[in-house]
Every structure is written in structure tokens, then in C-alpha cells.
Interface confidence: low
Amino acid sequence: GIAIPRNSGCPNSEDKNFPRTVMVNLNIHNRNTSTNPKRSSDYYNRSTSPWNLHRNEDPERYPSVIWEAKCRHLGCVKADGNVDYHMNSVPIQQEILVLRREPRHCPNSFRLEKILVSVGCTCVTPIVHHVA
Amino acid sequence: GIAIPRNSGCPNSEDKNFPRTVMVNLNIHNRNTSTNPKRSSDYYNRSTSPWNLHRNEDPERYPSVIWEAKCRHLGCVKADGNVDYHMNSVPIQQEILVLRREPRHCPNSFRLEKILVSVGCTCVTPIVHHVA
């Protein structure tokens, strides 16, 4: 991380392992003042690599609900609606940060956790290895 | 949010706005014990809706570096390598949580923030209305 100068206007920390444990305000600030117009809400259906969204819920996590994408087909959908198995539908994955209650059930103590989620699917050309 | 019972083994909080401000341990626990074998590292190049990755850096944010996808074409790449403008490359976007230093430059005080990031691109059929 970046070395940040100490600032007299900052909250104090008594933690001997500081800055490993920090104070976090859970009043979420949303940087996206309006929904992005290029809305992805229906892309899961219109994509040549369509996907279904599955609800992943965990009350010990913040956010407790995360939606996971699962590609519908192994191949990609052609203009005629049939699946082309010479192409592959693959999940686009992203590592995201979540807060995990630690110790368990504690309302005000969390550990930062990285989880891998599938956000959607894309159609790729398969890697084919030809033996000489 | 979920109502969590108070637990005698939990750290105490003196914050009058509790549980809006919580303690977070920044020693990240990575739930993905091994790198996902279906790694998406080269999908950006092999996709029919390929994308470039742009580095978005902000020292006041945690994580400070986020990679943003930007679709390379308006259309989608056909098997012959040409772009088909009857189809559209669109970004798959996801809202993610980050920590924003607040007050600014403070090393041990953060606010949770939601930001919208483009993770990759997918190829979709455009919405077109034909007048009878």
C-alpha cells in the first residue's frame, strides 16, 4: 500500500497491530450517482454466450447476497438460435472484496475477504493444440 | 441487514452509531485457496467481443489498483477476423465494494464505497425495432 502521512484530524487507533485493524463506516457511499445507461440487465439473455444468475446468500458476509453467473451452454449461440460448439461460452470472473464476520456472529467485527465471482459470460475461440 | 445477537466473545464497540462503524481486519483471507484453473487471463483476447484492460489507480482507495475493461470494437469479431457490426460488443459491469479513506489521507479510517466496474465484454444481439 501507499504510505499515507499521519493526520491530526484522523481517528486514533489503540490497536497494537495498527494499521491491520481499521475503522470502517458502513454507510455506503455510491459513486455511481445514476445507473449507467449502458445497463447490463438484459445482456445475460441477449448474449451469444447467455448466462443464468444464481443467488448466493451468506448472513455471515457483507454483502450477504451476491449474484453468480453460470453460462447456459458449452458453445455459443448463433444467429439462427442454434449452439455452435466450435466456440466456447466461458465465465468472466472477478475477485471482489467482501466483509466476513469474525468471530462468527459478531455484529461489529469483520475480516476483509477476497472471493472470486462469475459476473457474466463471453464467447471465446477455443485453444486447440495441434501435435506436430 | 440481518439482526445478529450480541455475543460476549465479540470485540466491544463504543461508537454511538454502532453498528454503522465497525472494526475490520485488513489481513485479507483469500477464499480461493488455489488460482482458479479456468483462468480468464486470456479471454480478453480470445473473445468475439475482445477488450483492453485499463489501470485505474487511486491511493485513497483500497484496493488502490482496479483494472477496467473497455471493449475494443462496437461490433463482434467473426471467425474470419472481421468485425460484424450487426452484433454489439458490450461491457459486463458489476458493482463492487471498496474502502475509501475518510477523512482523506487517514491511514486507519475508511468508508465503504460501491463503485461500478467493467469486468469484460460480451457479444449481444442489438435491440432493433422494425416498423410494420
Epitope: 459513486r31 455511481n32 450517482t33 445514476s34 445507473t35 449507467n36 445507461p37 449502458k38 445497463r39 | 485499463h54 485505474n56 477496467e68 473497455k70 462496437l74 454489439n88 461500478l116 467493467s118 442489438p126 435491440i127 432493433v128 425495432h129 422494425h130 416498423v131
Partner: antibody, heavy 124, light 111 residues
């Protein structure tokens, strides 16, 4: 020929209202997102509002939010801008413009067709 | 004050190359594609470039566009007298939730 024709401009007192119209021809109007853009005398272009092809989504510049309303009537091939609580700083030439791609695009293909503009003067 | 910054003016003699910059931030140029418009005095704007570097049909190949990071630029090579006009960059801005125009650059052809 693809054409956009604005009308409804004029001189109006501060605090009053005005409704601009933009008649579209030569393309399937209901397929395209539409914008209003204005230009004050001697100044640069300022984006005002956009509406999706089906009218379900609308976005406004902060300077007009809560005062202006963009709407469309696809059966009449017409785009509208309802302007309330007008201020002297709203004085400008108002252009309507068409998004360059059909469907759920707001800007990616640029604004490829513009009207000739209609002048709005807000003065007491 | 526009969120997309352009130089107020640029000039060159016929045949020269003139470049116009457009500086933005992550929420606009960093994430979205840039359009360029040309406006000659007394006329409506005309789309000159979209998607950073694609010219609509009818726009001469003397005009070229590029983008890098949070900046974009328009180059006019082989400058001609009819290129004398105001040029605006534009794109979507996620923070503002709207389309934004640059401050505009007046291009003058000298001599």
C-alpha cells in the same frame, strides 16, 4: 433524407414555461435514443438531456434537473422538451440530435444527425 | 467549467497538421469512448469521429482520433481552409450521469 426539425422556441419571461418539439423523418424514430443539446450565444455546446428509444430511460444535466422534462411520442415521430421555471441562463439555441445506433445506445456511436436548432430567449 | 478540458484555440497554415487534446478523468474518457464534433459558424454541429477513432462516412481521412488513459486527441493533417471551425470532444460521464462536451477548440487556418 434523415431530418430533424425543431420548433417551439421564442422569447419568454423568467419563471415561465416553454415546450420544444423535434419532428423526425427519414428513419425509424422508435429505434433510436434522442438528445437535446443547447448552445448559449457565443458559448460552447452543453448537453441537456437524453431519452432511450422506448422512453423508459431519461437522463438530465444537473443544470436542468427538476425543471426540464424530455419525452417522446413514437407514434408521431416527435421528441419534446418541456421547460419550466425558465432562467436567463437557459437562453440558447436548442438542438435535438439522434444517436448513431439503434437500440439501447445512448452515445456510443455519437450523435450523427442534428436539427438546425430553435432559439429560446429568457428575458424580462 | 467543463469536465472535459480542451485548449481554447489551435492554428496552422494550409497543409500543416493540427492536434487538439481533450483531457478528462476515469469516470468519462477512462471508461467510455470519445466522440468529436465540428461546428462551423452559424451551423449545427456535425459528427466527425466516434468510438475514439472511427470516422462516419463522408468525413475525410485527414481527420484521425486517438485515446489513451483519460485523454483523447483529434489530429487534422493536410489542413485546409474549410477546416476552420470549432471542435468539441464529448463522451458519457458516469459520475454526472450524462453526456458531456469539452470546452471547445477554435481552429484557425492561417495565411
Amino acid at each position: 433524407e434523415v431530418q430533424l426539425l425543431e420548433s417551439g422556441g421564442g422569447v419568454v419571461q423568467p419563471g415561465r414555461s416553454l415546450r420544444l418539439s423535434c419532428a423526425a423523418s427519414g428513419f425509424i424514430f422508435s429505434n433510436y435514443g434522442m438528445h437535446w443539446v443547447r448552445q448559449a450565444p457565443g458559448k460552447g455546446l452543453e448537453w441537456v438531456a437524453v431519452i432511450s428509444y422506448d422512453g423508459s430511460n431519461k437522463y438530465y444535466a444537473d443544470s436542468v434537473k427538476g425543471r426540464f422534462t424530455i419525452s417522446r411520442d413514437n407514434s408521431k415521430n416527435t421528441l419534446y422538451l418541456e421547460m419550466n421555471s425558465l432562467r436567463p441562463e437557459d437562453t440558447a439555441v436548442y438542438y435535438c440530435a439522434k444517436v448513431g445506433a439503434s437500440g439501447d445506445y445512448y452515445y456510443s456511436y455519437g450523435l450523427d444527425v442534428w436539427g438546425q436548432g430553435t432559439t429560446v430567449t429568457v428575458s424580462s | 467549467q467543463s469536465v472535459l478540458t480542451q485548449p481554447p484555440s489551435a492554428s496552422g497554415t494550409p497543409g500543416q497538421t493540427v492536434s487538439i487534446s481533450c483531457s478528462g478523468r476515469q469516470s468519462n474518457i477512462g471508461r467510455h469512448y470519445v466522440d468529436w464534433y465540428q461546428q462551423v459558424p452559424g451551423a449545427a454541429p456535425k459528427l466527425l469521429m466516434y468510438y475514439d477513432s472511427i470516422r462516419p462516412s463522408g468525413v475525410p481521412d485527414r481527420f484521425s482520433g486517438s485515446q489513451s488513459g483519460t485523454s483523447a486527441s483529434l489530429a487534422i493533417s493536410g489542413l485546409q481552409s474549410e477546416d476552420e471551425a470549432d471542435y468539441y470532444c464529448a463522451t458519457w460521464d458516469d459520475s454526472l450521469g450524462g453526456y458531456v462536451f469539452g470546452s471547445g477548440t477554435k481552429v484557425t487556418v492561417l495565411g
